[in-house]
């Protein structure tokens, strides 16, 4: 392309660079639905924001294709553990794409935090962090799931969260 | 703005892009003060560096406003656990801003690692990682706190650290 | 440099910016060699990719010098723990450089997950995540090691992985 075209592309890139897609969504009282769906998130209040990404029913929705570092942390805790709970808690980031009917696992962790109660207390806390780079197309969505979500502890948006930025 | 202005901005952006703010600070013998203050960090030796950010008394200080991925890991460990310590260890990243008198929680984890000793050995190890994107204004500071900091294990700067980069 | 030179540099930067180095490698059946070497990774199938970085025998190889956010997660698990296993599992990212004969520790975690089995089950799961910014020169390599690697659980590339991107 000629110099004018290159110039336009550079200007374009500068502007788009100013809004390199990024988001950080935070846990809220409404995050845990108990419906078997993904966790829901706060998108505006406090530390939460969306920049060049959108949100729909728990999902970060990609508007610009590319490689994204996606991450999530969940705060787990309890007083003992519910009976019948498998000794595994699964925390994962999953992709929804129009090209495939089922969610695809992207990044997943399994933990057994219920064995972490101290001798002095049946109370236990644990935290699970996931982060990694994935390619996402425009229109694709990423969600967070935790099984068993009853063990997710929400407070003020600082302990359980979900985010992404283009790399 | 005219082409000359645009050109200048592009040149400027190229230069600033070369120094996209980033930092990685490492744990050192002096990190744990026992004073109730934040952890202190090595800023120059070994793997530690500052690029487009500054440091003051444990804090990463922002010089250029924007969205930053901030992160910290702390290595926890002990031989048994002190009583009087709640069964929770809290590891957090906190913001100090001239516009507000108190530190603001950004990213926080709670863990109960003391219940993790094996049957006969009282030795336990655990690690806590935090990372997420937050908006920071020029002059704002981010610090790391761990309660109870007696359980933080320092060695060579690879196990406990604190960093950030602009996204 | 004159305007033509600046223009060339900008064009160059735009093109290189398009391929900001990034990679995400995933765990596979062949990852655990039992040979005492680093973990091996899938580089092409599924979620795995290399962009502006190369791969050799478990190592991410840097082609363009700069600051990189490097990360790794490993899924740990077992039914009890092997006898004689120290109560510590070490998960680390290490640098190989032509300028030094030994690997250098970059980011390391120690954990005692074997104490995490619940009272009703000897099964335990745990996850270790590492991430941080390091400076890497062209030709330098980064590898992942886990001691004892017998406790690493592989499945589908979502639970144990290794990646990097330039910041």
């Amino acid at each position: 392309d000629g110099p004018a075209g290159s110039w336009e592309q550079l200007i374009q890139e500068r502007r788009s660079h100013e809004v390199n897609p990024a988001a950080h969504l935070t846990g809220a009282n409404s995050s845990l639905t108990g419906s078997g769906g993904p966790l829901l998130w706060e998108t505006q209040l406090g530390l939460a924001f969306l920049r060049g990404l959108s949100y729909h029913d728990g999902a970060l929705v990609v508007t610009k294709a590319g490689y994204y570092y996606i991450y999530s942390k969940v705060q787990l805790g309890g007083v003992g553990c519910p009976l019948g709970l498998a000794s595994t808690i699964t925390h994962g980031l999953y992709k929804r794409t129009p090209r495939y009917p089922e969610e695809l696992e992207l990044l997943v962790s399994q933990q057994s935090p219920c064995g972490r109660a101290t001798s002095s207390s049946r109370v236990w806390w644990d935290s699970s962090f996931l982060g990694g780079v994935v390619h996402l197309e425009a229109g694709e969505e990423v969600v967070v799931r935790v099984l068993d979500e009853r063990l997710v502890r929400l407070r003020d948006g600082t302990r359980s969260y979900f985010g992404a930025f283009m790399v | 703005d005219g082409p000359a202005g645009s050109w200048e901005q592009l040149i400027q952006e190229r230069r600033s892009h070369e120094v996209n703010p980033a930092a990685h600070l490492t744990g050192a013998n002096s990190s744990l003060t026992g004073s109730g203050g934040p952890l202190l960090w090595e800023t120059q030796l070994g793997l530690a560096f500052l690029r487009g950010l500054s440091y003051h008394d444990g804090a990463l200080v922002v010089t250029k406003a924007g969205y930053y991925y901030i992160y910290s890991k702390v290595q926890l460990g002990g031989v048994g656990c002190p009583l009087g310590l709640a069964s929770t260890i809290t590891h957090g990243l906190y913001k100090r801003t001239p516009r507000y008198p108190e530190e603001l929680e950004l990213l926080v984890s709670q863990q109960s690692p003391c219940g993790r000793a094996t049957s006969s050995s009282r030795v336990w190890w655990d690690s806590s990682f935090l990372g997420g994107v937050v908006h920071l204004e020029a002059g704002e500071e981010v610090v790391v706190r761990v309660l109870d900091e007696r359980l933080v294990r320092l060695r060579d700067g690879t196990r406990s650290y604190f960093g950030a980069f602009m996204v | 440099d004159g305007p033509a030179g600046s223009w060339e540099q900008l064009i160059q930067e735009r093109r290189s910016h398009e391929v900001n180095p990034a990679a995400h490698l995933t765990g596979a059946n062949s990852s655990l060699t039992g040979s005492g070497g680093p973990l091996l990774w899938e580089t092409q199938l599924g979620l795995a990719f290399l962009r502006g970085l190369s791969y050799h025998d478990g190592a991410l190889v840097v082609t363009k010098a700069g600051y990189y956010y490097i990360y790794s997660k490993v899924q740990l698990g077992g039914v009890g723990c092997p006898l004689g296993l120290a109560s510590t599992i070490t998960h680390g990212l290490y640098k190989r450089t032509p300028r030094y004969p030994e690997e250098l520790e970059l980011l390391v975690s120690q954990q005692s997950p074997c104490g995490r089995a619940t009272s009703s089950s000897r099964v335990w799961w745990d996850s270790s995540f590492l991430g941080g910014v390091v400076h890497l020169e062209a030709g330098e390599e980064v590898v992942v090691r886990v001691l004892d690697e017998r406790l690493v659980r592989l499945r589908d590339g979502t639970r144990s992985y290794f990646g990097a991107f330039m910041v």
Epitope: S120, S121 | G77, V79, L83, S121, R122, V123, R150 | -
Partner: antibody
Amino acid sequence: EVKLEESGAELVKPGASVRLSCKTSGYTFTNYYVYWVKQRPGQGLEWIGEINPTNGDPNFNEKFKSKATLTVDKSSSTAYMHLSSLTSEDSAVYYCTRSNWDYGNAMDFWGQGTSVTVSS
Amino acid sequence: DIVMTQSPASLAVSLGQRATISCKASQSVDFDGDGYMNWYQQKPGQPPKLLIYKASHLDSGIPARFSASGSGTDFTLNIHPVEEEDAATYYCQQSIEDPFTFGSGTKLEIK
């Protein structure tokens, strides 16, 4: 001033049981484990076990599991050890001690000891 | 259980001289750079008294003539210069693994 005051000497018959007390003062009772240690006449020291005063959770040396019961009364900052089915092997001085985590779980304060003699 | 082997069983040292007591653990008692080894002094009719914690740290109120060192499995208690009041039995003890175990004791006599 940190103090651990133990109950007086006991003379008991074989097969009987005894309860020893350890009243603490001068520190926050719930902030330190209480350990119990046995010393037979002219012999060395044996760690019996510990109790967490916060919730009364005990942890024993396997050797003493069926012999000793450890309890606490938080209201009086007192720890107790109950020894059952006594035999001559149980004749010893029993010490309660405070464990200091900051000192690497060392026993930094000791009671004066309670002498238990098992004899018919 | 970790076995603590203390030597000698007894020793006689002249006033003002050095007394050295050794303690060997059947496995390492180190954690993160610290040895979880403690030393106690016991005089007849009295409870033991803590002298040294975490291999080399002097408890408060203990005179500086007491010192200790070691790591891993091998630890040493030194008293120099020995004084009359140091006549006692000395015990080492590990505090890293259940059950906590003591050495068999070293009886120090002052000549």
